[in-house]
């Protein structure tokens, strides 16, 4: 798997999408994990629904949001209010039994806001009741890492 | 802003059907869940089926099985329940709702009375 | 299928106290669990989803908590327009079930 850098600006949101193949992952509900280290385990940030058929349903674990369009075939994870802490690799994955596919790798770079001169005590910080819908989705840069570029910095 | 608009109450007859209608302003039609849910004088809520935009037809609690169907019509942004040989303790305020994000029930019709009466 | 048993079936408070609503599950719902509020003569109005997160324009005196079987519905300080009935409900398995309600009546 390719790894597709998706790009936010710190303190909005950004939409990160995964295609798949729905005949092939039919029936199967998806997850977003974040790498711990190149080699550690994808640990789970949400998933889709417990009922497949309603996967179209927004599933939210804090400031993350997961929605499926499982007809279309697009894993869709919303990242409200980025934040640095939100660098990272992360995988779309479809899951069946214990087991997991890997749908996606993805890298989330957080880029600061030139826009914003204010002190961080002014930072705009979304209420809990406010809606994953109503959110400003950032459009986000993507592009897939380059061959021989290197997804995870080498540990000295 | 979303709003779901039912059709008037309803009186019937025993063994006899009545078919209620939600309309939908705002938002796509077609790609949120209509659902059913009633509740009869005095009771609590019971969810009897919905239309869910990934199975593209109609799925329904097991104890209306057979007697209710639930359809869309697109072209006019609205739903129908339809139930069928009628009895008394069918006698409930019957609702729709939609989904927004989160749940099959985010936002809700005003509700329908259908009195079942001899 | 799912039974939700709420508790208690009638709570008497005054304006102004704290009312704390229990909604057990027969199995392990996971945290999907919402909760309504309704009025007489109205539609049910969504409050909580996912056990904890309060609905779009929901006051911060509402707030859910819980996980697996039992949940807890906590309104911090009763107002006027908070006397009402309120319905625990799950998602996790079919079919889709509610609670039999709890009713927040004024003392």
């Known amino acids: 798997h390719n790894t597709t850098v998706f790009q936010g600006v710190e303190g909005q949101s950004l939409q990160v999408s995964c295609p798949y193949d729905s005949m092939k992952h039919w029936g199967r509900r998806k997850a977003w994990c974040r790498q711990l280290g190149e080699k550690g385990p994808c640990q789970r940030v949400v998933s889709t629904h417990n009922l497949w058929l309603l996967s179209f349903l927004r599933r939210r674990n804090g400031s993350t949001a997961i929605t499926d369009d499982t007809l279309g075939g697009t894993l869709t994870i919303t990242l409200r209010n980025l934040q640095p802490h939100d660098a990272g690799f992360y995988q779309c994955q479809s899951l069946h039994g214990s087991e997991a596919d890997t749908l996606r790798k993805v890298l989330v770079e957080v880029l600061a806001d030139p826009l914003d001169h204010r002190d961080a005590g002014d930072l705009w910080v979304p209420g809990e009741s406010e809606s994953f819908e109503d959110a400003h989705v950032e459009h986000s840069i993507s592009r897939s890492l380059l061959e021989g570029e290197i997804p995870f910095p080498p540990t000295s | 802003q979303v709003q779901l608009v039912q059709s008037g109450a309803e009186v019937k007859k025993p063994g006899s059907s009545v078919k209620v209608s939600c309309k939908a302003s705002?938002?796509?039609?077609?790609?949120?869940?209509i659902s059913w849910v009633r509740q009869a004088p005095g009771q609590g809520l019971e969810w009897m089926g919905g239309i869910i935009p990934i199975s593209g037809t109609a799925n329904y609690a097991q104890k209306f099985q057979g007697r209710v169907t639930i359809t869309a019509d697109e072209s006019t942004s609205t739903a129908y329940m339809e139930l069928s040989s009628l009895r008394s303790e069918d006698t409930a305020v019957y609702y729709c709702?939609?989904?927004?994000?989160?749940?099959?029930?985010?936002?809700w019709g005003q509700g329908t009375m259908v009195t079942v009466s001899s | 299928e799912i039974v939700l048993t709420q508790s208690p079936a009638t709570l008497s408070l005054s304006p102004g106290e704290r009312a704390t609503l229990s909604c057990r599950a027969s199995q392990s719902v996971s945290s999907y669990l919402a909760w309504f509020q309704q009025k007489p003569g109205q539609a049910p109005r969504l409050l909580i989803y996912d056990a904890s997160n309060r609905a779009t324009g929901i006051p911060a005196r509402f707030s859910g908590s819980g996980s697996g079987t039992d949940f807890t519905l906590t309104i911090s300080s009763l107002e006027p327009e908070d006397f009402a009935v309120y319905y625990c409900q799950q998602d996790f398995h079919w079919p889709i079930t509610f609670g039999g309600g709890t009713k927040v009546e004024i003392k």
């Open positions: 709702a939609r989904t927004q994000e989160y749940t099959l029930f985010d936002i």
């Open positions: 705002g938002g796509t039609f077609s790609s949120y869940a």
